[in-house]
């Protein structure tokens, strides 16, 4: 028998520095977690103790903090090279800055293979990107070889900016011939490494003949066997065992997100490459693990540029950006409109001639808007200003909801109106009218939404049984501020871009902004 140790990360999202327990900015260092310096310490410790070790990443290193905003992926290549990753799968966020923003900083600089079997380049891009990412890679590990085959969410064109010259195929259809080829090339230990979410990971384990292990990402799934060491609640045991259609037991793993854990899986293979046993658990990278001094010094060196960036002008406002709780928790506020407009703008994807865009709606809890921006400072808007407005380090995500769920959300928005509570919704692509004289749960008297399947966008009444795409903060997608109905009833959830980054990009693009209060949210006469 031959034993392999798989160390894995996924959805690190630009958390190069240690973070607080909730993966936001580290405040009290003695209680902080993760970061590449701490990760390196643990990885090196395991590499020294065990003979056959692979360090893998299942995608979405890009996007999530000011590190990515400033360094645009160069930081990912640099520190992943320093940690000596063995392979990485492409995630949807790796395309956030377009194909060029993937090729130049990452694909050309990475000293490890970057993989995806279901992304096919066409047209002029085919020759430009040839060999920079691969469908699979065979890695020597000790005296054996292991095949790693990559995959990426086929929803990427709706979630990021891969352009028109990359085709995202069905994962299972694309993986099977690559695995067949590896088997015929005498590779009898095969890991599927990819970024399509836990449900697809399980399907790959079930359907793709010849895959021995699945290492996934995208859904930020936390798996654990025993008592979990932090706040994350396990979605199942680690590893999660799937019985394949041909009767094999296939371990499936994922390691939550944000570099908080290092996935640790031990696999035992027989001489024909069959999995005999698998066990392990994610390792919580808490402060009991010291940060590696040389990596930490390098982080500090790279940090200097970030501090300078924070105070640079992104653009100008010629109006007061009202982000006060007195406005945003009670009525339509122009800061809410600005943020929602930025959220929609960030999700413009012309993927179908029938649709002007795939999504037109935004909702945003007023309590998430934490500060106004005064235009009397020469109109200057900096990253620092935006960090005061959006201090929680969240993301603006894409969900699919039924109209009936949206109606419940808007009823919840005003169910206890007047108490300055955070659940009051700011909107984009939505016209809502409330009648506060009616009882809670029955206060939405009009709810019109902007069409997507139209050449001239217009507002139509919400249909209860129709499925709508909506951009919203991850906080709401996870049921925050009492929006349990969103968490319970959402049909799909894809994590999006860092909130501040979305707004800063929009402001930089627009150069001068002047958001107004324009009647998106109204109260019917006599009730307000």
């Amino acid at each position: 028998a031959w034993e392999l140790t798989i160390l894995h990360t996924n959805d690190v999202h630009s958390r190069l520095e240690q973070t607080s327990e909730d993966s936001s900015k580290c405040v009290n260092a003695s209680r902080c977690m993760g970061g590449v310096a701490r990760l390196f310490t643990k990885v090196q410790q395991i590499r020294r103790a065990e003979p056959n070790v692979l360090l893998l990443d299942a995608g979405d290193q890009y996007q999530g903090t000011i590190w990515f905003t400033v360094y645009k992926g160069a930081e990912v290549a640099h520190f992943m090279n320093a940690l000596r990753y063995d392979a990485m799968a492409l995630g949807n966020h790796e395309f956030d800055n377009g194909v060029e923003g993937l090729i130049e900083p990452l694909l050309k600089e990475a000293k490890f293979p970057i993989l995806s079997a279901n992304i096919k380049a066409k047209g002029p891009l085919a020759s430009q990107i040839s060999g920079l990412y691969l469908p699979y890679k065979v890695l020597p590990v000790g005296d054996e070889v292991v095949g790693i085959v990559g995959y990426t969410s086929k929803e990427t064109p709706f979630l990021s900016n891969p352009g028109t010259n990359l085709v995202f195929e069905d994962e299972i259809t694309a993986l099977q011939p690559e695995v067949d080829k590896l088997k015929t090339l005498n590779v009898n230990k095969i890991i599927a490494l990819g970024h399509s979410g836990f449900e697809m990971d399980k399907l790959i384990a079930q359907k793709v003949r010849g895959v021995d292990v699945v290492v996934g990402g995208h859904s930020n799934t936390f798996l654990y066997t025993g008592n979990p060491p932090s706040k994350e609640v396990p979605a199942g045991k680690y590893p999660f065992i799937v019985t394949s259609d041909d009767g094999r037991k296939v371990p499936v793993v994922q390691a939550y997100a944000f570099g908080k854990y290092l996935g640790y899986l031990k696999i035992e293979f027989d001489e024909r490459g069959n999995v005999i046993s698998s066990h392990g658990n994610p390792i919580l990278l808490n402060s009991s693990i010291p940060e590696d001094p040389s990596i930490k010094a390098d982080i500090n060196k790279w940090r200097i540029k970030l501090d300078n960036y924070s105070t640079q002008e992104l653009g100008k406002t010629i109006v007061y950006l009202d982000g006060s709780s007195q406005s945003c928790r009670f009525r339509e506020c122009n800061m809410g409109n600005l943020i929602c407009d930025a959220m929609i703008n960030n999700n413009l994807r012309h993927t179908d001639e029938m649709f002007w865009n795939h999504v037109s709606m935004c909702i945003l809890n007023g309590g998430g808007i934490r500060s106004p921006i005064d235009e009397r400072n020469n109109g200057t808007i900096t990253w620092e200003n935006l960090a005061a407005v959006l201090p929680f380090g969240g993301t603006f995500d894409l969900v699919q909801l039924k109209g009936s769920t949206l109606k419940k959300a808007f009823e919840h928005s005003v169910h206890r109106y007047g108490q300055s509570t955070g659940e009051f919704l700011q909107v984009g692509g939505i016209h809502v009218v409330y009648d506060l004289s009616r009882k809670p749960g029955d206060r939405v008297v009009k709810l019109d939404v902007l069409c997507t399947k139209c050449r001239v966008p217009s507002y139509d009444p919400l249909k209860m049984d129709e499925v709508y795409k909506v951009i919203l903060p991850n906080f709401l997608a996870n049921g925050g501020d009492g929006f349990q109905m969103i968490k319970d009833e959402l049909l799909r959830h894809d994590s999006g871009d860092q909130d501040i980054n979305v707004v800063s990009t929009y402001i930089s693009k627009m150069k001068v902004i002047y958001p107004a209060v324009e009647g998106r949210i109204k109260f019917s006469t006599g009730s307000h």
């Epitope: 060999g131 065979v138 020597p140 070889v145 067949d180 080829k181 088997k183 015929t184 090339l185 005498n186 590779v187």
Partner: antibody, heavy 120, light 107 residues
Framework: QVQLVESGGGVVQPGRSLRLSCAAS????????MHWVRQAPGKGLEWVAV????????YYADSVKGRFTISRDNSKNTLYLQMNSLRAEDTAVYYC?????????????WGQGTMVTVSS | DIQLTQSPSSVSASVGDRVTITCRAS??????LAWYQQKPGKAPKLLIY???SLQSGVPSRFSGSGSGTDFTLTISSLQPEDFATYYC?????????FGGGTKVEIK
């Protein structure tokens, strides 16, 4: 001892068909991927095709794709190469070879070869 | 397809000479290269696999080195039975390809 013996070669006219066989003995045939490699007179070696151990996966050189079919019968310990639409440039000694069980494939056991001549 | 270019195409040497044959791949193939010896009228014989590992039963005067795109087969002290044609071969991907061959002749 471990052995591969090819048969079925001969002289054939262009456009016609021929079926080569390779009988294996001395090892567990069904555990190994099997290959055909050819060598035109006075020329170098050219890989032709492979079939996986259980026979489900097959790959071919571009020069024979669509014309040649590799197959195997594990119950008879025999490898086959069905050659259709033969051309003059298919004239060669055809070897069957065992791809060993490790990566990368190397050919550790070869047959003695069978000569195929395509001529009008 | 991965092309393998062997050089020289032929070499004249004497018994006891050190002979070096090179094989260059058109793209990175790690260390996944094999070397074969073929004598006239015979099937090829495997000498080296994975660039530098000696196949069992092959004399230690044969050695292989290299990785990535550049590889070398060295015969440290040529023996009479070593006069033959030598081929490199990659199986990093399908189609499997061979080099054009290097004929080692008696000077």
């Amino acid at each position: 001892q471990v052995q591969l013996v090819e048969s079925g070669g001969g002289v054939v006219q262009p456009g016609r068909s021929l079926r080569l066989s390779c009988a294996a003995s001395g090892f567990t045939f069904s555990h190994y991927g099997m290959h055909w490699v050819r060598q035109a007179p006075g020329k170098g070696l050219e890989w032709v095709a492979v079939i996986s151990d259980e026979g489900s996966n097959k790959y071919y050189a571009d020069s024979v794709k669509g014309r040649f079919t590799i197959s195997r019968d594990n119950s008879k310990n025999t490898l086959y190469l069905q050659m259709n639409s033969l051309r003059a440039e298919d004239t060669a000694v055809y070897y069957c070879a065992r791809g060993w069980l490790r990566y990368p494939i190397a050919f550790d056991i070869w047959g003695q070869g069978t000569m195929v001549t395509v001529s009008s | 397809d991965i092309q393998l270019t062997q050089s020289p195409s032929s070499v004249s040497a004497s018994v006891g000479d050190r002979v070096t044959i090179t094989c260059r791949a058109s793209q990175d193939i790690s260390s996944w290269l094999a070397w074969y010896q073929q004598k006239p009228g015979k099937a090829p014989k495997l000498l080296i696999y994975a660039a530098s590992s000696l196949q069992s039963g092959v004399p230690s005067r044969f050695s292989g080195s290299g990785s990535g795109t550049d590889f070398t087969l060295t015969i440290s002290s040529l023996q009479p039975e070593d006069f033959a044609t030598y081929y490199c071969q990659q199986a990093n991907d399908f189609p499997i390809t061979f080099g054009g061959g290097t004929k080692v002749e008696i000077k």
